[in-house]
Amino acid sequence: QVATGEGLQIQIMYFNLETVQVTWNASHYPRSNLSFHYKFSRDEAYDQCTVYILQEGHTSGCLLDAEQQDDILYFSIRNGTHPVFTASRWIFYYLKPSSPKQVSFSWHQDAVTLTCSDLSYRGLLYEVQYRSPFDTEWQSKQENTCNVTVEDLDAEKCYAFRARVKAMEDAYGPDTYPSDWSEVTCWQRGETRDSCPEPRTPPKPKLSK
C-alpha cells in the first residue's frame, strides 16, 4: 500500500483500531536488520519498535499498539542511524476490521438471519455470502449492522454461509482491507451440517473428432 522508490516496499495494516502492523520488503538491504522508530504525536520523541516481525532472521516489520484516538503515525525505518524511509500517515486509511464474532443463525421458513456482535466503531458493513451446491458463485448481502437476513432460500437445499466485515469507503477511503472470513457454516432444513456437497461445475463440452 505504501511504497518507496528506494528499494523499500512498505505495507501498513491497522487491525481493528487496536494494532498497527508496518511491514517492509527491503530488496536493497538483503542482510540488514532495519530498525523501526515511531510516534503518534509530532511533538513526542520517536520510540523504537519492541515487537519486530522477522523473516529469515532479519527484521521485516513491526507491530505496535494504537488507541482509537491515535490518527497519525509518524515513522522512520533506519539502517543503523541512516533513515531509509520516513513518513507520516493517517492510519485509518489502512483499517482491517476484525472478523465477525459470536456469529449465530436463526431460520424462519425460507429465510435465515445471521447476527453477530457489532464492532465498537462506526462506518462498517457486515457482509454475508452464501451458496448452495447449485451455485457456482457466492451470493452476497450486506448491512450496516450485523443483522443480515437472506431471503428466498430453499429449505431443502444445503447452504454454506460465511461472513466478514468491511470498512465503508465513504468513511475510510478505498484502500482498506476487509476482515478475514468467518468459518464457513453449512445449514440444511434449519439444522447445521458438517459440509455441503461441492458446487457442481458445468460439464465440459465434448470435442468432436
Epitope: V2, S88, W90, F92, Y93, E169, Y172, G173, D175
Partner: antibody, heavy 122, light 107 residues
Framework: QVQLVESGGGLVKPGGSLRLSCAAS??????????WTWIRQFPGKGLEWMGY???????YYNPALKSRITISRDNAKNSLYLQMNSLRAEDTAVYYC??????????????WGQGTLVTVSS | EIVMTQSPATLSVSPGERATLSCRAS??????LHWYQQKPGQAPRLLIK???RSITGIPARFSGSGSGTEFTLTISSLQSEDFAVYYC?????????FGQGTKLEIK
C-alpha cells in the same frame, strides 16, 4: 447545500496577527463525520493545507505552521476561525475555508468558500 | 511530506480534443488522489475523488485513473469552459499536499 463565506482579510504589518472567520450556512459544522479546513493559495498559485477542526473540535495543524496558527469554532454562530500570529511577507495569500467529504479529515475537499485575501506588508 | 508533481506545467489543446494531465506522488498513496479545477477568481472545485470516483454534477467527460504513484486526469472532449488550472491532492500522507498545478490553455 453548504455555503462558506470567509471574512477578515486585508493588509497586515509584518509581525502582526490576523483572525479570519468562515461562516457556514445550509449545513451544521457539528454534523458528525465532517471536518473543516483552512487552505491558502499563494500569489504563485500554490495551494497549502493549513489545518483541520472536526465536528468533535479535534484539531490538526500543518507541522510547518503549527506554532503560529490556531483553528477554532463557534457552534452557535456556525462559524470557524483561523488565528495566525507572527505574520511574514510570505504569508501573503488568499485564504479559503473548505469542508472535507464525509469520512472526515483524510480525504478531499468538496465545498470551498470564495476566499479572502491577506497581504502582509509594511 | 509527500511531494506531488504535475506535468506538464502548461498544456495547449484545441477545443474538442482530448487532454491528458499527469500527477506523480513521491510515495505510494494507493488510490487516495483527488483532482480539482480552478478558474480565475474562483475557488478550486472538486472534480474526481479517490483517483477515479466521479463527483455529482461534474460532466462525464472528466475521468481519472491510476494508483500507487502515477495518476492521470483525462478530459475526453474539451469544451471552452474546461480551460483552467488543474490541481491534484493526496490525502493519506500527513499533511495533505497539492501538486503545483497544470494550466490547460486553448491552442
Amino acid at each position: 447545500q453548504v455555503q462558506l463565506v470567509e471574512s477578515g482579510g486585508g493588509l497586515v504589518k509584518p509581525g502582526g496577527s490576523l483572525r479570519l472567520s468562515c461562516a457556514a450556512s445550509g449545513f451544521s459544522i457539528t454534523t458528525s463525520g465532517y471536518y473543516w479546513t483552512w487552505i491558502r493559495q499563494f500569489p504563485g498559485k500554490g495551494l497549502e493545507w493549513m489545518g483541520y477542526i472536526g465536528y468533535n473540535s479535534k484539531t490538526y495543524y500543518n507541522p510547518a505552521l503549527k506554532s503560529r496558527i490556531t483553528i477554532s469554532r463557534d457552534n452557535a454562530k456556525n462559524s470557524l476561525y483561523l488565528q495566525m500570529n507572527s505574520l511574514r511577507a510570505e504569508d501573503t495569500a488568499v485564504y479559503y475555508c473548505a469542508r472535507s467529504l464525509y469520512g472526515g479529515y483524510k480525504d478531499a475537499f468538496d465545498s470551498w468558500g470564495q476566499g479572502t485575501l491577506v497581504t502582509v506588508s509594511s | 511530506e509527500i511531494v506531488m508533481t504535475q506535468s506538464p506545467a502548461t498544456l495547449s489543446v484545441s477545443p474538442g480534443e482530448r487532454a491528458t494531465l499527469s500527477c506523480r506522488a513521491s510515495q505510494s498513496i494507493g488510490t487516495s488522489l483527488h483532482w480539482y479545477q480552478q478558474k480565475p477568481g474562483q475557488a478550486p472545485r472538486l472534480l474526481i475523488k479517490f483517483a477515479s470516483r466521479s463527483i455529482t454534477g461534474i460532466p462525464a467527460r472528466f475521468s481519472g485513473s491510476g494508483s500507487g504513484t502515477e495518476f492521470t486526469l483525462t478530459i475526453s472532449s474539451l469544451q471552452s469552459e474546461d480551460f483552467a488550472v488543474y490541481y491534484c491532492q493526496q490525502s493519506p500522507g500527513f499533511p495533505p499536499t497539492f501538486g503545483q498545478g497544470t494550466k490547460l490553455e486553448i491552442k
